[in-house]
Interface confidence: medium
């Protein structure tokens, strides 16, 4: 899982993605439910190798929460070909797995 | 306790249409994918197709295209399956189910559908 | 579209028996997912993620593959190991196997 500090790292990161599902967990150290569902964002990480995982930290990446429109903690988006494919908010470990699995 | 409770058994005539539904206690539908399942008498099992509750995003395979509509009312913690233009080869057993990733999925316990003149 | 191709069709098998029943994907998956049915009754999830068993299943039962060649296998078939079984695939779009038919010898 690669933590991404900058607009620039993160634009980086969805360029070099190129055809590959990429995962991104907006979240927040103050915010319990990401705290939850870290391990298990770290576990999918290594379950799915051909997935790029992403974990942004809201308070230190304003500028991407704002671009990406982020409203609430925890948001995940997907994006393939840096184009965003999907998007949901809460911290559901099912739900996450089974829209990984649909949009790989 | 996850329970998902589908609606009785239905005998229709063919080229009528059919609305099953299934009721789910012990989670909220806008959490997950709901999915429906076809099995035909002593036949295997055919994925149908699933909704995201929480937006209505559906997606079927290909087959069932135009076959079926599945939709959700999130108030009342209900998925429906409708099939229309029915024919003797949708006399199925149509469960709905919660397909999880984890140790444990839960399905309904199936409405049989007859198409009988 | 994934298929997945499941062999034999049918099988019978005596009590203590080795039982070992395959399924072949058209593409490379990443998780098989195997299902017990028995008559009149809803599938049951049976094996997750390849090889891990569900809850209650029993420790004779296992499973295992990767790539497009995944098998379920009971070390020593007991009469209520008698049903049919189906892998299942998670792909964008599910798939299931046509099912092996297990009966008791």
């Known amino acids: 899982v690669k933590q991404i500090e900058s607009k620039t790292a993160f634009q980086e990161a969805l360029d070099a993605a190129g055809d590959k599902l990429v995962v991104v967990d907006f979240s927040a150290t103050w915010c319990g439910p990401c705290k939850m569902i870290k391990p298990f964002f770290h576990s999918l990480s290594e379950k799915y190798s051909n997935v790029i995982f992403l974990e942004v930290d809201v308070d230190d990446c304003q500028d991407v929460a704002s671009e990406c429109e982020v409203k609430c903690m925890i948001t995940f988006q997907f994006f393939k070909k840096g184009q965003k494919v999907g998007e949901f908010s809460g911290a559901n470990k099912e739900k996450l797995e089974a829209t990984i699995n649909e949009l790989v | 306790e996850v329970q998902l409770q589908q609606s009785g058994a239905e005998l229709v005539k063919p080229g009528a249409s059919v609305k099953l539904s299934c009721t789910a206690s012990?989670?909220?539908?806008?959490?997950?994918?709901m999915h429906w399942v076809k099995q035909r008498p002593e036949q295997g099992l055919e994925w149908i197709g699933r909704?995201?509750?929480?937006?209505?995003?559906?997606k079927y395979d290909p087959k069932f295209q135009g076959k079926a509509t599945i939709t959700a009312d999130t108030s009342s913690n209900t998925a429906y399956l409708q099939l229309s233009s029915l024919t003797s080869e949708d006399t199925a057993v149509y469960y709905c189910?919660?397909?999880?990733?984890?140790?444990?999925?839960?399905w309904g316990q199936g409405t049989s559908v007859t198409v009988s003149s | 579209q994934i298929v997945l191709t499941q062999s034999p069709a049918i099988m019978s098998a005596s009590p203590g028996e080795k039982v070992t029943m395959t399924c072949s994907a058209s593409?490379?998956?990443?998780?098989m997912y195997w299902y017990q049915q028995k008559p009149g009754t809803s599938p049951k999830r049976w094996i997750y993620?390849?090889?891990k068993l569900a809850s209650g299943v029993p420790a004779r039962f296992s499973g295992s593959g990767s790539g497009t060649s995944y098998s379920l296998t009971i070390s020593t078939m007991e009469a209520e190991d008698a049903a049919t079984y189906y892998c299942?695939?998670?792909?964008?779009?599910?798939?299931f196997g046509a099912g092996t038919k297990l009966e008791l010898k």
């Open positions: 593409s490379r998956i990443s998780y």
């Open positions: 299942h695939q998670r792909s964008s779009y599910p798939t």
């Open positions: 189910a919660l397909l999880q990733y984890s140790a444990m999925d839960y």
């Open positions: 993620d390849t090889s």
């Open positions: 012990g989670f909220n539908i806008k959490d997950t994918f």
């Open positions: 909704i995201d509750p929480a937006n209505g995003n559906t």
